[in-house]
């Protein structure tokens, strides 16, 4: 690399992928293996991120950019830049410190992550329950009971809901 000749800071001419080497009279030296500098004028190169454990490499480290990780199947990313991996659960479950646990009766989760949420209360909107909720699915609200008066609708009102047993915790 050519020795830099900036009047202000000789390091300012060092491009990304190099560092300004004080041990060699501020010559721009290439970043050593497993390190990078993403901007010019750096006095050191940063150590490349290693994707260990259930982290897996999405993008290899280069002299000018850090490695990027994602998570192996069974886990998903959390945090900026996938700084953490968190385990997946099945639909109808939520993650706790005790692992994946079934949603309590009256709650559901339709994803592999996140928490169980209460079923929609149809009556708050003046509607009736058209399809009962499950651990995996929210209830489906139908027309209001008034809309179901004779001649007003062809929709048959649902049979009274049979309350299932409480989900095990």
């Amino acid at each position: 690399f050519e020795r830099t000749r900036s009047l202000q800071d000789p390091c300012s001419n060092c491009p990304a992928g190099t560092f300004c080497d004080n041990n060699r009279n501020q010559i721009c030296s290439p970043c050593p293996p497993n390190s990078f500098s993403s901007a010019g004028g750096q006095r050191t190169c940063d150590i490349c991120r290693q994707c260990k454990g259930v982290f897996r490499t999405r993008k290899e480290c280069s002299s000018t950019s850090n490695a990027e990780c994602d998570c192996t199947p069974g886990f998903h990313c959390l945090g900026a830049g996938c700084s953490m991996c968190e385990q997946d659960c099945k639909q109808g479950q939520e993650l706790t410190k005790k692992g994946c646990k079934d949603c309590c009766f009256g709650t559901f989760n339709d994803q592999k992550r996140g928490i169980c949420r209460p079923w929609t209360n149809c009556s708050l909107d003046g509607k009736s329950v058209l399809v009962n909720g499950t651990k995996e699915r929210d209830v489906v609200c139908g027309p209001s009971p008034a809309d179901l008066s004779p001649g007003a609708s062809s929709v048959t009102p649902p049979a009274p809901a049979r309350e299932p047993g409480h989900s095990p915790q």
Epitope: G53, L78, S83, M84, C85, E86, Q87, I115
Partner: nanobody, 123 residues
Framework: EVQLVESGGGLVQPGGSLRLSCAAS????????MNWVRQAPGKEAEWVAN????????YYVDSVEGRFTISRDNAKNSLFLQMNSLRDEDTAVYYC????????????????WGQGTTVTVSS
């Protein structure tokens, strides 16, 4: 450098025992939840067990409950997994993982991982 290094894996017969260890360095070990996670060949990774900062709370996946015991020695910055009554289906790479800074507060992400140690259960 923040680091976790597992050891203790090997080949063992069904019904046998193994004790895995994880040496932690570069961070205040006693301040973090710690976990064991495993990945069997061709299968999704699976959380196995966790332990809180002082060792007073320990939780396990159902399939290992009563057979595996997680423990820690904060004075030696070490995490352990005692594995008894091993089965063929316990064959996997076992990883030690640190719980993230907000672990247990509706988030259970793990931010630091070891390279893993291989456990093979076979007759």
């Amino acid at each position: 450098e923040v680091q976790l290094v597992e050891s203790g894996g090997g080949l063992v017969q069904p019904g046998g025992s193994l004790r895995l260890s994880c040496a932690a360095s570069g961070f205040t070990f006693r301040s973090y939840w710690m976990n064991w996670v495993r990945q069997a060949p061709g299968k999704e990774a699976e959380w196995v067990a966790n332990i809180n900062q002082d060792g007073s709370e320990k939780y396990y996946v159902d399939s290992v409950e009563g057979r595996f015991t997680i423990s820690r020695d904060n004075a030696k910055n070490s995490l352990f997994l005692q594995m008894n009554s091993l089965r063929d289906e316990d064959t996997a790479v076992y990883y030690c993982a640190r719980g993230g800074p907000d672990y247990g507060d509706l988030h259970y992400g793990m931010d630091v991982w070891g390279q893993g140690t291989t456990v093979t259960v076979s007759s």
